[in-house]
Amino acid sequence: MMTGTIETTGNISAEKGGSIILQCHLSSTTAQVTQVNWEQQDQLLAICNADLGWHISPSFKDRVAPGPGLGLTLQSLTVNDTGEYFCIYHTYPDGTYTGRIFLEVLESSVAEHGARFQIPHHHHHH
């Protein structure tokens, strides 16, 4: 039975040209995390593999940085970065846990972070 939950940074906003940290945290499970994938809609941004470390997708290397922790830092934000981001935790033996973050990149300087909140976990067995 999958007991884990993912906590994310939730709905967040940031200013154009700035940076933002995307964070997820998996709790309430003793499952071993084998890999975390970070995705933006239909593109894989980066992976952190327990054995092999961090790897950033070649098309994002210039403005995506690993961390802190299992999180991801997006730099030089543009309005095109607005949208959904997903952290996908591959675990053993549970399977896959997915967290969702919505980022809005604003033209003005009124951007502010949303509060952290719990989201229901989605899971798919491999």
Epitope: D42, Q43, L44, L52, G53, H55, P58, S59
Partner: antibody, heavy 117, light 107 residues
Framework: EVQLVQSGAEVKKPGASVKVSCKAS????????IEWVRQAPGQRLEWMGV????????NYKEKFKGRVTITADKSSSTAYMELSSLRSEDTAVYYC??????????WGQGTTVTVSS | DIVMTQSPDSLAVSLGERATINCKAS??????VAWYQHKPGQSPKLLIY???YRYTGVPDRFSGSGSGTDFTLTISSLQAEDVAVYYC?????????FGGGTKVEIK
């Protein structure tokens, strides 16, 4: 120029072990993964495992766990793949490749391993 | 493990005509798919990475598309030197499984 040069062909008896080397040159050895892929006659390419030469971290396909060992010697920029308890089905061409995780951009020339009694 | 299923197994195309190869993943792999060309007696060569990015030096007649579970490699105008076996491979999670290959020949 990036190059991966593999050791020569091997003929082994069932139950024996084989160790294939892959010498890298033309790039920073510890900045890329080294992946191992094989192709048995008439079969698809099969991923076997990978090493991060910088950290020494390895990841193996489940079917090879306990039978394959991938290592890397940073001082000589050489990776090794050792496969034990050989059987006839292990007859294949074994390739090393430089990995960016998201793709394998340079490949060795391949090493033919024949397992026969 | 993620299973990559290629179709067709083989393809005969006239010189200058379009060749299309499909690859289906057994589960979501985002855009983490690469395509390789493998000629007899040679090592595989990278053509496409991240589903649609052409690798350095690869002719622009090769293109890739797709995301999620369905992917396509297209050779827009087949040349004699394109005769080979083509493989897709997923890099979404280990083990980095390959498709079964598609043999492309001249009709």
């Amino acid at each position: 120029e990036v190059q991966l040069v593999q050791s020569g062909a091997e003929v082994k008896k069932p139950g024996a072990s084989v160790k294939v080397s892959c010498k890298a040159s033309g790039y920073a050895f510890t900045n890329y993964l080294i992946e191992w892929v094989r192709q048995a006659p008439g079969q698809r390419l099969e991923w076997m495992g990978v090493i991060n030469p910088g950290s020494g971290g390895t990841n193996y396909k489940e079917k090879f766990k306990g039978r394959v060992t991938i290592t890397a010697d940073k001082s000589s920029s050489t990776a090794y793949m050792e496969l034990s308890s050989l059987r006839s089905e292990d007859t294949a061409v074994y390739y090393c490749a430089r990995g960016e995780y998201f793709f394998f951009d340079y490949w060795g020339q391949g090493t033919t391993v024949t397992v026969s009694s | 493990d993620i299973v990559m299923t290629q179709s067709p197994d083989s393809l005969a195309v006239s010189l200058g005509e379009r060749a299309t190869i499909n690859c289906k993943a057994s589960q979501h792999v985002s855009n983490a798919v690469a395509w390789y060309q493998h000629k007899p007696g040679q090592s595989p060569k990278l053509l496409i990475y991240s589903a649609s990015y052409r690798y350095t030096g690869v002719p622009d007649r090769f293109s890739g598309s797709g995301s999620g579970t369905d992917f396509t490699l297209t050779i827009s105008s087949l040349q004699a030197e394109d005769v080979a076996v083509y493989y897709c491979q997923q890099h979404y999670n280990t083990p980095h499984t390959f498709g079964g290959g598609t043999k492309v020949e001249i009709k």
